[in-house]
């Protein structure tokens, strides 16, 4: 499966949305910067089988769709802007359940892709457990905007990878 | 009773490599993340490197990471650690820790080794 | 990476007195903080996960208290076995990190 130009795409758009969504200042939050631990090693790419790096990725693109998804996140970035992320966060997902479908059929999927998953949902509940700690403030939003495009950032680098593995 | 037996500890030179193995009974290896934590003669505890129970989800420490690997055969309930290029700050003793949860971070080391010592000299 | 301050680095008490360790992180780890017993010429055991639970066998003189940068290890009436080292660690991200150790002896 090739993973259409399209997901690119989609991943630079949805990396604009979010630095659009940015409304206040970065230097006003230098207080409440935090380090989530990113599995950096999950995204390194070099154990990976295609359909292992694929739902690895699916894992991070359905965390942050439920992330941006919650009554909190509503109330705190602007509604039209959160509507396209959540459409590109969508269109991302489907490509990616398309490539696994396709990729399940030639190679069996290793156990070892349970820890990746894992490693993947453990970050997202450090993020949801910090803006809890926070009380869901602005400025614990804004940390985790930018935290989630920075793993974007991350992820964009893995894709492409995979793409001229291909 | 569950244990967790190291080996392969000894004496070697400066830029040599190592492996140590562990051994472990009593539990369900395959469904917990283990690490290997260190301790220098005398001084504090050092977490070395971590393996998801899968044998995915690999971590380790700055000090040791591009020259330390770790590996697990969970048919065997075997735990492994790589040493290459040690240095004399590598000299401790090495202990085979298993964690609570089957991958690293959000948990603890529930579970601890004899050790193992490795000493790195000339 | 985050830095974990244990203090005091060591300590002397006698038996049945109340004894507090503190430890302290440079960035919150909610409550993934544990403790650690090592006794002379053992490897460490645990005492404490997750802040505040007690591992099964350990002691019920032993709690811990705390949350996000702050914690504390009691031992509410020290007997002549708790001579050892203790080790807070957060286990909220790699690189796991330990505190220096505190040792309690003994008067």
């Known amino acids: 499966c090739d993973l259409p130009q399209t997901h690119s795409l989609g991943n630079r758009r949805a990396l604009i949305l979010l630095a659009q969504m940015g409304r206040i200042s970065p230097f006003s939050c230098l207080k409440d910067r935090h380090d989530f631990g990113f599995p950096q090693e999950e995204f390194d790419g070099n154990q990976f089988q295609k359909a292992q790096a694929i739902s690895v990725l699916h894992e991070m693109i359905q965390q942050t769709f439920n992330l941006f998804s919650t009554k909190d996140s509503s109330a705190t970035w602007e509604q039209s802007l959160l509507e396209k992320f959540s459409t590109e966060l969508n269109q991302q997902l489907n490509d990616l359940e398309a490539c696994v479908i396709q990729e399940v059929g030639v190679e069996e999927t290793p156990l070892m892709n349970v820890d990746s998953i894992l490693a993947v949902k453990k970050y997202f509940q450090r993020i949801t457990l910090y803006l809890t700690e926070k009380k869901y403030s602005p400025c614990a939003w804004e940390v985790v905007r930018a935290e989630i495009m920075r793993s974007f950032s991350l992820s964009k680098i893995f894709q492409e990878r995979l793409r001229r593995k291909e | 009773e569950m244990q967790l037996m190291e080996s392969g500890g000894g004496l070697v030179q400066p830029g040599g490599s190592l492996r140590l193995s562990c051994v472990a009974s009593g539990f369900t290896f395959k469904s917990f993340a283990m690490s290997w934590v260190r301790q220098a003669p005398g001084k504090g505890l050092e977490w070395v490197a971590s393996v998801g129970s899968q044998g995915g989800s690999k971590y380790y420490a700055p000090s040791v990471k591009g020259r330390f690997s770790i590996s697990r055969d969970n048919s065997n309930n075997t735990l492994y650690v790589q040493m290459n290029s040690l240095g004399v700050e590598d000299t401790a003793f090495y202990y085979c820790v298993k964690e609570t949860d089957a991958v690293a971070t959000m948990d603890a080391l529930d579970m601890w080794g004899q050790g193992t010592l490795v000493i790195v000299s000339t | 990476d985050i830095r974990v301050t244990q203090s005091p680095s060591s300590l002397s008490a006698s038996v049945g007195d109340r004894v507090s360790i503190s430890c302290q992180t440079s960035q919150s780890v909610n409550i993934y903080l544990n403790w650690y017993q090592q006794r002379p010429g053992k490897g460490p055991q645990l005492l404490i996960s997750?802040?505040?639970t007690l591992q099964s066998g350990v002691p019920s003189r032993f709690s811990g208290s705390g949350s996000g940068t702050d914690f504390i290890l009691t031992i509410i009436s020290l007997q002549p076995e708790d001579s050892a080292s203790y080790y807070c660690?957060?286990?909220?991200?790699?690189?796991?990190?330990f505190g220096q150790g505190t040792k309690v002896e003994i008067k």
């Open positions: 660690q957060q286990g909220y991200i790699t690189p796991y990190t």
């Open positions: 997750a802040a505040s």
